[in-house]
Interface confidence: low
């Protein structure tokens, strides 16, 4: 999906209002120094591409992210403010429906969520630079 035509201001507002809080809740109990932040993005569409990949792409190391509250809100936000995004996600949604409920947050997901926080912060920074 090409994120070029998204309403970045609205996405930023949704992130600051709800998604960020859910991400931070997920990371509670870990120190900000626990994980090196390495994932980067160069502009707003690129940041959203990376955010989508780390939030929704399947990884055997970390099974449960797509079912987390922050992931659901991210999906809703992208569907709302990125034209045509929801259509591209139908197959992904069907695949996730097959997923069984995971019970525990393993620390192997924490690295990924830590990177997500970094990507969102980068997204906000690139937004501020453009204004």
């Amino acid at each position: 999906y090409d994120f070029t035509n998204c309403d970045f201001q609205k996405i930023e507002a949704d992130y600051l209002r709800t998604i960020s809080k859910d991400l931070i809740t997920y990371m509670s109990g870990t120190k900000s120094t626990d994980f090196n932040n390495t994932v980067s993005c160069s502009n707003r569409p690129h940041c959203l591409t990376e955010i989508q990949s780390l939030t929704f792409n399947p990884t055997p190391r970390c099974a449960s992210l797509a079912k987390e509250m922050f992931a659901r809100k991210t999906k809703a936000t992208l569907a709302l403010w990125c034209p045509g995004y929801s259509e591209t996600q139908i197959n992904a949604t069907q695949a996730m429906k097959k997923a069984r409920k995971s019970k525990v947050t393993t620390n192997k997901c924490l690295e990924q969520v830590s990177q997500l926080l970094g990507l969102w912060r980068r997204f906000i920074r690139t937004l501020l630079k453009k204004q």
Epitope: N37, E50, P60
Partner: antibody
Framework: EVQLVESGGGLVQPGGSLRLSCAAS????????MTWVRQAPGKGLEWVSS????????YYADSVKGRFTISRDNAKNSLSLQMNSLRAEDTAVYYC??????????????WGQGVLVTVSS | DIVMTQTPLSLSVTPGEPASISCRSS???????????LHWYLQKPGQSPQLLIY???HRASGVPDRFSGSGSDTDFTLKISRVEAEDVGVYYC?????????FGGGTKVEIK
Amino acid sequence: EVQLVESGGGLVQPGGSLRLSCAASGFTFSNYDMTWVRQAPGKGLEWVSSITFASSYIYYADSVKGRFTISRDNAKNSLSLQMNSLRAEDTAVYYCTRGGGAYHGGSLDVWGQGVLVTVSS
Amino acid sequence: DIVMTQTPLSLSVTPGEPASISCRSSQSLLHINGYTYLHWYLQKPGQSPQLLIYLVSHRASGVPDRFSGSGSDTDFTLKISRVEAEDVGVYYCEQTLQTPYSFGGGTKVEIK
């Protein structure tokens, strides 16, 4: 162009050491897990080691555990494999590959040209 | 550890004819997240391997649509609908469900 270029191979005596390097270009290196795969002459592919994008998690095949060390320098877009206590059975072409993480389901979607390591007296 | 077994060991195919390679895992490759961690690679003579299919059935970028993957749990198949001369090489399946990741022994495809 997305590219991985390995270096550091060569002939080494049993018990010796060698350090393989992999230079990445054409993509945001720090966003990807990286993996070393090897192929003994005339044989199939064998997974050696993987490292996550932030180096938080590192995995080794039992055959190299305790002897090989994988590391990465995201600032320099480079991946390394330090190989100690080398044995004849470590003789192989070593491939640097991109993947093992959230992209393409952990598959290895980019491969280097490979570098030959020969362990012989 | 998960053991991957490929059959046949080698395959001789007439150009334009279909070909099929089987890969079996010693345990299910279905993850709790609903995805199945089975991938296919092709190593052409004198070249590095290249990704063909990931997550059972998704074609990698630039891979012709004559290649298709199918299967579930422990049994998987790579099909080439019409073999071309450039398809010769060794085909490998790989599981990335759990470490140690493992490859099948390979299937050598040649042209008759």
